[in-house]
């Protein structure tokens, strides 16, 4: 039994790392293997994490984690029984993928405004949360080629945008995606989408 | 809001003991290793003890065997027991919340040795 | 036990002038676990620098940390009237756990 690819890990940047390889062959990844891990600290202990397949040879681990600070290190082992078959290590603020927002909603009762607001994924006392910014999609239902994105550069998780830059009389979806520039991380999952029927008064025309 | 607050200070005789507790709130306690530091009237700051998730602990060598370090993750609550004091124990002693440094801290309770 | 030694023990300057803070360490210490604190009197510590050059959240620009090794420096660019107070080094060592410096205080001239 041999790792084919080698463990890849990355962090929410507040107490889960999910890490993932590939074996070479099909294997039970549950049964077979164990990854323990261990906080580079005076005061931590080893943990062990039970692997879920991913696919025929893939294994998937979530570990439960400390809360993440920058100087973080944990050593990681991936044993077959007695065997160790990998040993490495991990910092979890240089691999981040931050958590997807949530409580996306869309407030239409605001004088041909659209609000859109959603929660930051993270508690006060997190670091990343005064250093998210987000991404925003909104689409249509009914014509795929209306499809757009709004950069939300600020740190308030709400976004203002005029009813009548979509067109009216037709529903449309909106989701919620974020990031930290702080950690260079990747983006987050897309949150839940959310939908609404977006109706406002046309101007009368004056001649 | 972080928010960290000691209690159990007060006036104890030389060989005397006290329990001092931190009642903690506004993060998730169990994921977080704790301490205590203390600093004694018109001194700098000295580290005390430690204790990890897991519960294993670190004691400064001026305290070892005579202190002992505790939590309860279900009351979200951190304990010092000091038995056999002295009196250059007697110090404002501070909760704090960290690991390799300590960004936050409690406002600190007296412990006063004296006869 | 790593020791760490800070000078000068009382720095006496006028608001507006810089200050330099030292800690020198014992044996080498990791740039990572190096941290400043200011403290007030009646006041519990605030940690200023973390990883011996980061500010901590909210702490203001003038303030800055450098430094590798055994050698550190806090910066203050310029002194504005609450930054007079006393300032810790405080370093972390796998082994040997927790240590403060003995502090330095910033008194106004």
């Known amino acids: 039994m041999k790792v084919l690819q080698e463990p890849t890990c990355v962090s929410d940047y507040m107490s889960i790392s999910t890490c993932e390889w590939k074996m070479n062959g099909p294997t039970n990844c549950s049964t077979e293997l164990r990854l323990l891990y261990q906080l580079v600290f005076l005061l931590s202990e080893a943990h062990t994490c039970i692997p879920e397949n991913n696919g025929g040879a893939g294994c998937v681990c979530h570990l439960l984690m400390d809360d993440v600070v920058s100087a973080d290190n944990y050593t990681l082992d991936l044993w077959a029984g007695q065997q160790l078959l990998w040993k490495g290590s991990f910092k979890p603020s240089e691999h981040v993928k931050p958590r997807a927002p949530g409580n996306l909603t869309v407030h239409t009762n605001v004088s041909d405004t659209l609000l859109l607001t959603w929660s930051n994924p993270y508690p006060p006392d997190n670091y990343l949360y005064n250093h998210l910014t987000y991404a925003v999609n909104i689409w249509s239902e009914n014509d795929p080629a209306d499809f757009r994105i709004y950069n939300v550069t600020y740190l308030e998780p709400s976004l203002r945008i005029a009813a009548s830059t979509l067109k009216s009389g037709i529903s449309y979806r909106a989701r919620v995606r974020a990031w930290a520039q702080c950690y260079n991380t990747t983006w987050s999952e897309w949150s839940p989408s959310t939908k609404w029927h977006n109706s406002y008064r046309e101007p009368f025309e004056q001649h | 809001e972080v928010q960290l607050v000691e209690s159990g200070g007060g006036l104890v005789q030389p060989g005397g003991s006290l329990r001092l507790s931190c009642a903690a709130s506004?993060?998730?306690?169990?994921?977080?290793?704790m301490f205590w530091v203390r600093q004694a009237p018109g001194k700098g700051l000295e580290w005390v003890s430690g204790?990890?998730?897991?519960?294993?602990?670190s004691y400064a060598d001026s305290v070892k065997g005579r202190f002992t370090i505790s939590r309860d993750n279900a009351k979200n609550s951190l304990y010092l027991q000091m038995n056999s004091l002295r009196a250059e124990d007697m110090a404002v002693y501070y909760c704090?919340?960290?690991?390799?440094?300590?960004?936050?801290w409690g406002q600190g309770t007296l412990v006063t040795v004296s006869s | 036990e790593i020791v760490l030694t800070q000078s000068p023990g009382t720095l006496s300057l006028s608001p507006g002038e810089r200050a330099t803070l030292s800690c020198r360490a014992s044996?080498?210490?990791?740039?990572?676990?190096l941290a400043w604190y200011q403290q007030k009197p009646g006041q519990a510590p605030r940690l200023l620098i973390y990883?011996?050059?980061s500010r901590a959240t909210g702490i203001p620009d003038r303030f800055s940390g450098s430094g590798s090794g055994t050698d550190f420096t806090l910066t203050i660019s310029r002194l504005e009237p609450e930054d007079f107070a006393v300032y810790y080094c405080?370093?972390?060592?796998?082994?040997?756990?927790?240590?403060f410096g003995q502090g330095t205080k910033v008194e106004i001239k």
């Open positions: 405080q370093q972390y060592d796998h082994s040997a756990g927790w240590t």
């Open positions: 704090a919340r960290g690991r390799y440094y300590f960004p936050w």
């Open positions: 204790i990890g998730t897991g519960g294993a602990t």
């Open positions: 506004g993060f998730t306690f169990s994921r977080n290793a």
């Open positions: 990883g011996a050059s």
């Open positions: 044996q080498s210490v990791s740039s990572s676990y």
